[in-house]
């Protein structure tokens, strides 16, 4: 057999379909690998051939297109199952060829089972809705091409096990499900079941998606740097460890890249000849607002280091902000020191390790706080 451009197994397209439902699978060659479409290929005399390898088998075999009621058929660059069976799971290959040209790609197809509440191993797409933002809609996905526009299917929407009937803030409107106003309680899995007739038979398409309610752009603000701030002075003796947390709050913004970084004397830490480590942690609120903390650490700080400028920077699609940390070399004899308690929120551990000096409103008195948990 002559050489064939083999694109291998395209695991990026892990196709999952429900058992006992129609499935239309386009040959990925025309979508992702070749510069021309099926019509061009067909008119150039190229033929599209399909075959498959069953699950847990090595043997490639032709697809049986002579099954009763044309259960599996091919139409242009689409492989049709009407409907799927569990044992259709396997790796499918589409090959485009003539006497002088050959190109092929394989992809995995998994036929999955669901229960009556639509629980299954299916990977679910996530649709984000803005909290308290006004009417927003989700649309029953991936149903195009299954039936002609002349066919009017029936669509039923479910949340979990239960049918959604015009109630509260969620209203089914055909292929759309409208959220009059979205709340955190609307988080969850929503399923549309599309039922349509074809050649005297009735088919069902089940599509589940996850709704995640996120922060509204109406409430979005530029990044807010909580730390460093004007109330905290990092006073250290040479040889001690310097730890400065940079804690930044980011409003949720669709497709925004949130960035936090430190500069030391206006340069990136990597460009400074000192031993600096930076550890980052990220947490999210229920509406996907983000808090990023980058802790800058110098194990054994020198008096030179204590003269440097340490600036925390943050950027999102809403803007860029920066805040300098106040770093000082500890004076040998402070006027007095008070041992005391008192909570300072989430950074207690860092503050305790630091024995941070707190500047009381305008006065010159420094207080050591050893925090107890």
């Amino acid at each position: 057999s002559e050489r064939c451009d083999d694109w291998g197994l395209d695991t990026m397209r892990q196709i999952q379909v429900f058992e006992d439902e129609p499935a239309r699978i386009k040959c990925p060659l025309f979508e992702h690998f070749l510069k021309f479409n099926y019509s061009t290929a067909h008119s150039a005399g190229l033929t599209l051939i399909w075959y498959w390898t069953r699950q847990d088998r090595d043997l490639e075999e032709p697809i049986n297109f002579r099954l009763p009621e044309n259960r599996i058929s091919k139409e242009k660059d689409v492989l049709w199952f009407r409907p799927t069976l569990l044992n259709d799971t396997g790796n499918y290959t589409c090959m485009l060829r003539n006497t002088t040209y050959c190109s092929k790609v394989a992809f995995p197809l998994e036929v999955v089972q669901k229960d009556s509440c639509f629980n299954s191993p299916m990977k679910l797409p996530v649709h984000k809705l803005y909290i308290e933002y006004g009417i927003q809609r989700i649309t029953c996905p991936n149903v195009d091409g299954y039936f002609p526009s002349s066919v009017k299917p029936t669509i039923t929407w479910y949340m979990g096990c239960y049918k959604i009937q015009n109630f509260n803030n969620v209203i089914p409107e055909g292929m759309n499900l409208s959220f009059l106003i979205a709340f955190i309680s609307n988080n969850g899995n929503y399923t549309c079941v599309v039922t349509y007739p074809e050649n005297g038979r009735t088919f069902h398409l089940t599509r589940t998606l996850t709704v995640k309610v996120v922060g509204s752009p109406k409430n979005a603000v530029p990044p807010v740097i909580h730390s460093p701030n004007d109330h905290v002075v990092y006073e250290k003796e040479p040889g001690e460890e310097l730890l400065i947390p940079c804690t930044v709050y980011f409003s949720f913004l669709m497709d925004s890249r949130n960035e936090v970084w430190w500069t030391i004397d206006g340069k990136k830490p990597d460009d400074i000849p000192i031993d600096v480590t930076i550890n980052e942690s990220i947490s999210h609120s229920r509406t996907e607002d983000e808090t990023r903390t980058q802790i800058l650490s110098i194990k054994k700080v020198t008096s030179e280091d204590l003269k440097r400028s340490y600036v925390c920077h943050a950027r999102s699609a809403k803007g860029e902000v920066a805040k300098a940390a106040t770093v000082k070399q500890k004076v040998p004899a402070p006027r007095y020191t008070v041992e005391g308690g008192g909570g300072t929120g989430g950074l207690n551990d860092i503050f305790e390790a630091q024995k941070i000096e707190w500047h009381e409103g305008g006065g010159h008195h420094h207080h050591h706080h050893h925090h107890h948990h």
Epitope: D115, S116, C117, G160, C161, Y162, I164, Q165, V170, S185
Partner: antibody, heavy 120, light 107 residues
């Protein structure tokens, strides 16, 4: 501790309706679903339908469609099951049962049951 | 609708013995099956879901197995409090349906 407390026993005439309540304690309404299951004397269990109280989303067994209405009042954490056009074969203990989540089709907590007797 | 058939209708077992209860579905329900225990005058209690996962607080002597159409509930060593009626429930298809029950009585 999760508790589902149902209303008391009822005696009804054929052709009438009955409305049974199920009050949840322990903040169990939010994010859960409540189903109604009945058990005729000496018989097995029969699922009638259910609701996600937060959404008013319901599902009914075909057998009871049009005759049963399941509702919920979130403010009082109470679910209701109303069965109309009663006949003698509707004599049964009616249970409310909580799903472990809106996506779980099994029942992890049950009410104590309400006996409904249909007799002329 | 899917018909669930339990056997035997009554099972007589001595305390400490093993009890094996069977539940058969009229068509495949995958692993979408639950087991409940009901004592006289009480509401049912969830034992097993997903055919084999024990519910919270259920002793290890209760185990479930099977998939498709054949399922088994095993009580490895019967205690006095285990004498009751046991029901299986399928939730693969609407409507959810229960078996008619197996009564486990003292021999």
């Amino acid at each position: 501790q999760v508790q589902l407390v149902q209303s008391g026993a009822e005696v009804k005439k054929p052709g009438s309706s009955v409305k049974v309540s199920c009050k949840a304690s322990g903040g169990v309404f939010s994010g859960y679903a409540i189903s109604w299951v009945r058990q005729a004397p000496g018989q097995g269990l029969e699922w009638m339908g259910g609701i996600i109280p937060e959404f008013g989303a319901t599902n009914y067994a075909q057998k009871f469609q049009g005759r049963v209405t399941i509702t919920a009042d979130e403010s009082t954490s109470t679910a209701y099951m109303e069965l109309s056009s009663l006949r003698s074969e509707d004599t049964a203990v009616y249970y409310c049962a909580r799903h472990s989540s809106a996506y779980s089709p099994w029942f992890d907590y049950w009410g104590q049951g309400t006996l409904v007797t249909v007799s002329s | 609708e899917i018909v669930m058939t339990q056997s035997p209708a009554t099972l007589s077992v001595s305390p400490g013995e093993r009890a094996t209860l069977s539940c058969r579905a009229s068509q495949s329900v995958s692993s979408n099956l639950a087991w409940y225990q009901q004592k006289p005058g009480q509401a049912p209690r969830l034992l097993i879901y997903g055919a084999s996962t024990r519910a919270t607080g259920i002793p290890a002597r209760f185990s479930g197995s099977g998939s498709g159409t054949e399922f088994t509930l095993t009580i490895s060593s019967l205690q006095s409090e285990d004498f009751a009626v046991y029901y299986c429930q399928q939730y693969n298809n609407w409507p959810w349906t229960f078996g008619q029950g197996t009564k486990v009585e003292i021999k």
